[in-house]
């Protein structure tokens, strides 16, 4: 035969009742026992587990004068703001002498209007771009059927007939509101209303139209913007920094960008005041009354080289017999590119001009024809880059060399 001590009679004279209500309800479970001698501590169980943090109070009333007489012990468990996690079977547990006693169970149930676990959130979407919205609700009682509404218009004939937890929207051309209704046997709860703001699509095909040393002309194709016309587009240019290395789609430039606004149409803009022969990254976003599109990826571009903007400086030319010594300094004005060298021209009063490419040197000794009797000799110097020659210096007369 199965082993086990015959249990003594249960000390419980009152067992927990049942509570069923909506979320947020406050209720009390109560159990009562009659014991002889010192009253035990009453513990509460939910689904067979001791409640470590129970909001319980215990009252003990002696039924006689002597400590060994009977006591009535009442334990009350307070449930504040009923939640799903509070539901289950409740019992009182006492340890009396050598034995463990458990009361008959009471039940706590939840029953009310549906409760939202997830509601649609405000968001921005690009025009005509698919997206999903989420809504989730629970009872009890179950089942809970959902009905989605767009701009207060139901998207299905009845709750539970259309999309449930996830609503797929193939695209919008105007800012719209979405909400969901949760229906169960107790009634209807309506979620918050989410505003879905329709922004312009990201512009496409950002490209260079023309290049000048200090300006770039760029163009792009605008994306769809729904029923909202584009008001302007914003172009940003930033100096490329090899150290930072802007990657395609990197969210922020490494420094404060140069920002220009373009009226649209046309979807084209001339960016000026740039550095010649300099790499830049550019991007564009377009704005409607609803807000800006996302930026395009950064596009690497480069301004071309220009010619030096000024002549070489401090030119001096001295003559000693049939030789002339000429030297100069780099132009102070911007070179607009990589200096490739200098050109020198000299000419007498009645003689043809002689042109020379000096390279990157900043001095030259000229061998003059004849005995050097050519009069009124003058020298001009110009710097050049791959883009061409810069301006020539003013003619500098060759002075006779005076020793010491």
């Amino acid at each position: 035969a199965p082993r086990g001590t015959q249990a003594e009679e249960s000390p419980f004279v009152g067992n927990p009742g049942n509570i069923t209500g909506a979320r947020g309800l406050t209720g009390t479970l109560r159990c009562q026992l009659q014991v002889q001698g010192e009253p035990p501590e009453v513990h509460w169980l939910r689904d067979g587990q001791i409640l470590e943090l129970a909001d319980s109070t215990q009252t003990q009333v002696p039924l006689g004068e002597d400590e060994q007489d009977d006591w009535i012990v009442v334990s009350q468990l307070r449930i504040t703001s009923l939640q799903l996690s509070d539901t289950g079977q409740y019992q009182c547990l006492v340890f009396l002498g050598h034995q463990t006693f458990v009361s008959q169970p009471g039940y706590v149930g939840l029953e009310g209007l549906p409760y939202f676990l997830e509601e649609p959130e405000d968001r921005t979407v690009a025009a005509n771009t698919p997206f999903n919205l989420s809504c989730q609700a629970q009872g009890p009682p179950e089942p809970v059927d959902l009905l989605w509404l767009q701009d207060a218009v139901p998207l299905a004939t009845a709750p539970g007939h259309g999309p449930q937890r996830s609503l797929h929207v193939p695209g919008l051309n105007k800012t719209s509101s979405f909400s969901c209704e949760a229906h169960n046997a107790k009634g209807v709860t309506t979620s918050r209303t989410a505003t879905i703001t329709v922004l312009p699509q990201q512009p496409r095909n950002l490209h260079l139209v023309s290049r000048q040393p200090t300006e770039l002309e760029v163009a792009w194709t605008p994306g769809l913007s729904g029923i909202y016309p584009l008001t302007h587009c914003t172009l940003q240019a930033v100096l490329s920094d090899d150290g930072m290395g802007i990657q395609a789609g990197e969210p922020d430039p490494p420094e404060e960008p140069l920002t220009s606004q373009a009226s649209v149409p046309p979807h084209q803009l001339r960016l000026g005041s740039l550095h010649p022969h300099t790499p830049y990254h550019i991007r564009v976003a377009c704005t409607s009354s609803q807000g800006p599109s996302s930026w395009t990826h950064w596009l690497p571009v480069e301004t071309p080289e220009g010619v030096p903007l000024g002549p070489p400086e401090n030119i001096s030319a001295t003559r000693n017999g049939s030789q002339a010594f000429v030297h100069w300094q780099e132009p102070r004005a911007p070179l607009q590119g990589t200096l490739l060298g200098y050109r020198l021209a000299y000419q007498g009063q009645d003689t043809p001009e002689v042109l020379m490419d000096i390279g990157l040197r900043q001095e030259v000794t000229l061998e003059l024809q004849g005995d050097g009797s050519v009069s009124n000799l003058t020298v001009c110097v110009a710097a050049y880059t791959a883009a061409g020659d810069g301006p020539w210096s003013l003619p500098v007369p060759l002075e006779a060399w005076r020793p010491g």
Epitope: A7, D47, I50, T100
Partner: antibody
């Protein structure tokens, strides 16, 4: 009087499944956890898992998670343990016991001897 | 998981001798809410199901002879048989029920 009644023996073939029963009486079945314990011949006691009849909430020893499934039938106050893909390693005595929240009294079934043999 | 370790795994004594066996848990078995230590000792005689001797580490189950005593706190527990009788031939298991159940490996008591 509290009783946990188990059949004395079961013989099954390797690879088969079996469902052992434990019929409870003499107390409120839904209010106490039922534990299952395994004992192979000449070996010690191993806790398999437990089930709370009211909610069918279960806990398992990791070692038995893929081997054993605990269920209850409240209407007949019976607890069950089902084994799948049986091998000779599953040959053992299986006890059901009523948990008393760490205290006393303590009730055990007499155990079912499961033999897996072809 | 709580691990229970018993020692020795077996011992042989003569009738009338005192016996102690040890059980160690990998963590404390004291429940702060109920202020109980969830450790039990079982006796299993050959061919029988286990029988509860001690619960709450030191409380003797009714009907168990007073030669059986449980002691210990925290993680170290001892079962003492003050004067072994021939009928005490059995395997003794400790069990924690602080968090689910775990049994120790058992101590086999033989009578010389």
């Amino acid at each position: 009087q509290v009783q946990l009644q188990q059949p004395g023996a079961e013989l099954v073939k390797p690879g088969a499944s079996v469902k052992l029963s434990c019929k409870a009486s003499g107390y409120t079945f839904t209010s106490y956890w039922i534990n299952w314990v395994k004992q192979r011949p000449g070996q010690g006691l191993e806790w398999i898992g437990n089930i709370y009849p009211d909610s069918s909430s279960t806990n398992y020893n990791e070692k038995f998670k893929s081997k054993a499934t605990l269920t209850v039938d409240k209407s007949s106050t019976t607890a069950y343990i089902q084994f799948s893909s049986l091998t000779s390693e599953d040959s053992a005595v299986y006890y059901c016991t009523r948990d008393t929240y760490g205290g006393s009294p303590d009730y055990w079934g007499q155990g079912t001897t499961l033999t897996v043999s072809s | 998981d709580i691990v229970m370790s018993q020692s020795p795994s077996s011992l042989a004594v003569s009738a009338g001798e005192k016996v102690t066996m040890s059980c160690k848990s990998s963590q404390s078995l004291l429940n702060s809410r109920t202020r109980k230590i969830y450790l039990a000792w079982y006796q299993q005689k050959p061919g029988q199901s286990p029988k509860l001797l001690i619960y709450w580490a030191s409380t003797r189950q009714s009907g168990v002879p007073d030669r059986f005593t449980g002691s210990g706190s925290g993680t170290d527990f001892t079962l003492t048989i003050s004067s072994v009788q021939a009928e005490d031939l059995a395997v003794y298991y400790c069990k924690q029920s602080y968090n689910l159940w775990t049994f120790g490996g058992g101590t086999k008591l033989e009578i010389k």
